[in-house]
Amino acid sequence: MDSFNYTTPDYGHYDDKDTLDLNTPVDKTSNTLRVPDILALVIFAVVFLVGVLGNALVVWVTAFEAKRTINAIWFLNLAVADFLSCLALPILFTSIVQHHHWPFGGAACSILPSLILLNMYASILLLATISADRFLLVFKPIWCQNFRGAGLAWIACAVAWGLALLLTIPSFLYRVVREEYFPPKVLCGVDYSHDKRRERAVAIVRLVLGFLWPLLTLTICYTFILLRTWSRRATRSTKTLKVVVAVVASFFIFWLPYQVTGIMMSFLEPSSPTFLLLKKLDSLCVSFAYINCCINPIIYVVAGQGFQGRLRKSLPSLLRNVLTEESVVRESKSFTRSTVDTMAQKTQAV
C-alpha cells in the first residue's frame, strides 16, 4: 500500500482550492475529469486504433519493398516512428483516467512520454532527408542516377534516428516521478530543479530544431520543387501540391499547440494563473500532437484514391502503389513521378 504502485484515494477535487467546507466529509471516490482531459482521452483512443493498425499496414506493405525501392525505405521509417509512439498511448491514457496519477514507476516515466518527442525529431529529420532526396531528384538527376541507392537511404535514416535520439535525451534525463503528499498522487513530469534557464533552453531548442527551422527549410525546399514541377508541366502538379501541402501542414498544425504552450510555460512562474491554465491544457496539446502518429496512413489512402482512382482496390494494394512507386530519372529534363508526383511526400510524419 505504500509503494509507487498503489492506488491512492482520489482527492483531486481539492486541487486549486484554498477555501473548503469544514463540515463536508472527505470524498475518496473518483471525481469527474476536466473537459481538456476528456478530449485528450478521445483523441488518444482514436489515434491508438488508427495509428497502430494504419502504421502496421504501412510497415507490412513497405517492408517487402524496402530492399529495392527507396521510397519504401522512407515510408517504412516514418511508419516505424509513428507505430512506436502509439505503443505508449495505453499507458498515457491510463494515467489521465487516474487524474494524472503515475503508478508505472520511474523508468516508464522517463521512456514513455519521451517517445512522442523521439517521434517528432525522427519524423522531422526523416522528412528533411526525404525532402533532400526529392530536391536532388528534381535538380540533380544525373547525381541521383549515379549515387542514389538503398544503401545510402538506409545510412541517411540511421543518421536521422541517431540525431533524434540525441535530441530526445534532455527530455529523458529531466523526467522524474514526484510523489505529492496532498492530494496523494505520484506524478510523472519534467523537473529542472527550478533552473528556469535550463528549462527555457530545452524549450527553445525544441521549438527551433523541431518546428521553426524545419518549417522554414521545408517551405523553401518545396517552393523550389513545385516551381520546377510546374515549369515542366507535370501532369498532376496541382494534385501534388495538395498532397505536399497536406503532408507538410499536418506536421506543423498538430505540433503548433504543443510548441506554443511549451515555450510559454518555460517563461512563466509555475504558480502563475496562466501557467496553471496551460498545464491543464497540456494533455490536450500532447494528444493533438499525437494525431501526427495516425495521419500518415490516412493521407496515403486519400492520396492513393485521389490520384489513381483505386477505390475498388484493396487497401494494401492501394498503399503499395502510393508508397513503393520508384522515382524515374529522365536524362537532362528530370521529372519525378514518385515524390513530387505521388504521395511520396509524406516525408513529414510525426
Epitope: 486541487d15 463540515n23 472527505v26 514526484r178 505529492e180 503528499y181 498522487k185 523537473d191 509555475p270 504558480s271
Partner: antibody, heavy 121, light 112 residues
Framework: QVQLQQSGPELVKPGASVKISCKAS????????MNWVKQRPGKGLEWIGR????????KYNGKFKGKATLTADKSSSTAYMQLSSLTSEDSAVYFC??????????????WGQGTTLTVSS | DVVMTQSPLSLPVSLGNQASISCRSS???????????LHWYLQKPGQSPKLLIY???NRFSGVPDRFSGSGSGTDFSLKISRVEAEDLGVYFC?????????FGAGTKLELK
C-alpha cells in the same frame, strides 16, 4: 479545542517492541491524516509516516518500513504506532501530528506532547 | 527526498531587533495545483513544535503579525520584525508538497 494526548514515556530493552498511542479530541478524527514524527537530539525531525483513520490507508517513509506499523481505532479516536526490533537508534521523542484534510491550512498543524522512548539494556 | 537547508543554525539576537531565517529546498516545492507547501514551526525546550506560518506566507491562528514568511520555488525566509522573549526557541522549516515530509535542521534563536 484540538488536543492530541500521547501515552507516557517508555523504557524498553533492545529487540523488544513498543506501542505508542495518541488520543485525538476536538475535531473530526476521520477527516484527517495522523502523522508520526521522530525527533532525536542533534538529528532534527524525521517523518515516519501517516495513516488515514477512515479506512486505515497508510503511507510510510521508506526509512521506517518494517520498523513502524501505524494503526487507528475510529471508535476511540486513537492512533497507534508500533515500533519493532528496537535498538538504541530508536531512542527518541515520538510525536503524533494531524493533517486536516478539509481545511484551508493544508499543513501539519497540531502536535501531541511527545512520547519519550528509551531503548536500553 | 527533498533536503531542507536552514541557515543560520544559530541566531543570537537582542530583544526588539529584527531576525531573519533562511530555508532552501533541494527541489521546487510548487505543487501541481500551484500552491507551495512550505511551513514554519517554533519549538520551545521540552515542548512540541507549534505551527507559525503555512503555505509560505500565511500566519496560523493566534500567531502575532510580527511573524512573516516569504519566498518561492526553492528559496524561503521567515522574518520576525521585533523579537520578544517568548519568540526564543528552535525554528524549523518544513515541506508537505512531496512525500516524505521533510524538515530543516532548525535555527536556534537565542539572546545575544
Amino acid at each position: 479545542q484540538v488536543q492530541l494526548q500521547q501515552s507516557g514515556p517508555e523504557l524498553v530493552k533492545p529487540g523488544a517492541s513498543v506501542k505508542i498511542s495518541c488520543k485525538a479530541s476536538g475535531y473530526a478524527f476521520s477527516n484527517s491524516w495522523m502523522n508520526w514524527v521522530k525527533q532525536r537530539p542533534g538529528k532534527g525531525l524525521e517523518w515516519i509516516g501517516r495513516i488515514y483513520p477512515g479506512d486505515g490507508d497508510t503511507k510510510y517513509n521508506g526509512k521506517f518500513k518494517g520498523k513502524a506499523t501505524l494503526t487507528a481505532d475510529k471508535s476511540s479516536s486513537t492512533a497507534y504506532m508500533q515500533l519493532s526490533s528496537l535498538t538504541s537508534e530508536d531512542s527518541a521523542v515520538y510525536f503524533c501530528a494531524r493533517f486536516l484534510l478539509i481545511s484551508t491550512v493544508t499543513a501539519v498543524d497540531y502536535w501531541g506532547q511527545g512520547t519519550t522512548l528509551t531503548v536500553s539494556s | 527526498d527533498v533536503v531542507m537547508t536552514q541557515s543560520p543554525l544559530s541566531l543570537p539576537v537582542s530583544l526588539g531587533n529584527q531576525a531573519s531565517i533562511s530555508c532552501r529546498s533541494s527541489q521546487s516545492l510548487v505543487h501541481s495545483n500551484g500552491n507551495t507547501y512550505l511551513h514554519w514551526y517554533l519549538q520551545k525546550p521540552g515542548q512540541s513544535p507549534k505551527l507559525l506560518i503555512y503555505k509560505v506566507s500565511n500566519r496560523f491562528s493566534g500567531v502575532p503579525d510580527r511573524f512573516s514568511g516569504s519566498g518561492s520555488g526553492t528559496d524561503f525566509s521567515l522574518k520576525i520584525s521585533r523579537v520578544e522573549a517568548e519568540d526564543l526557541g528552535v525554528y524549523f522549516c518544513s515541506q508537505s508538497t512531496l512525500v516524505p515530509l521533510t524538515f530543516g535542521a532548525g535555527t536556534k534563536l537565542e539572546l545575544k
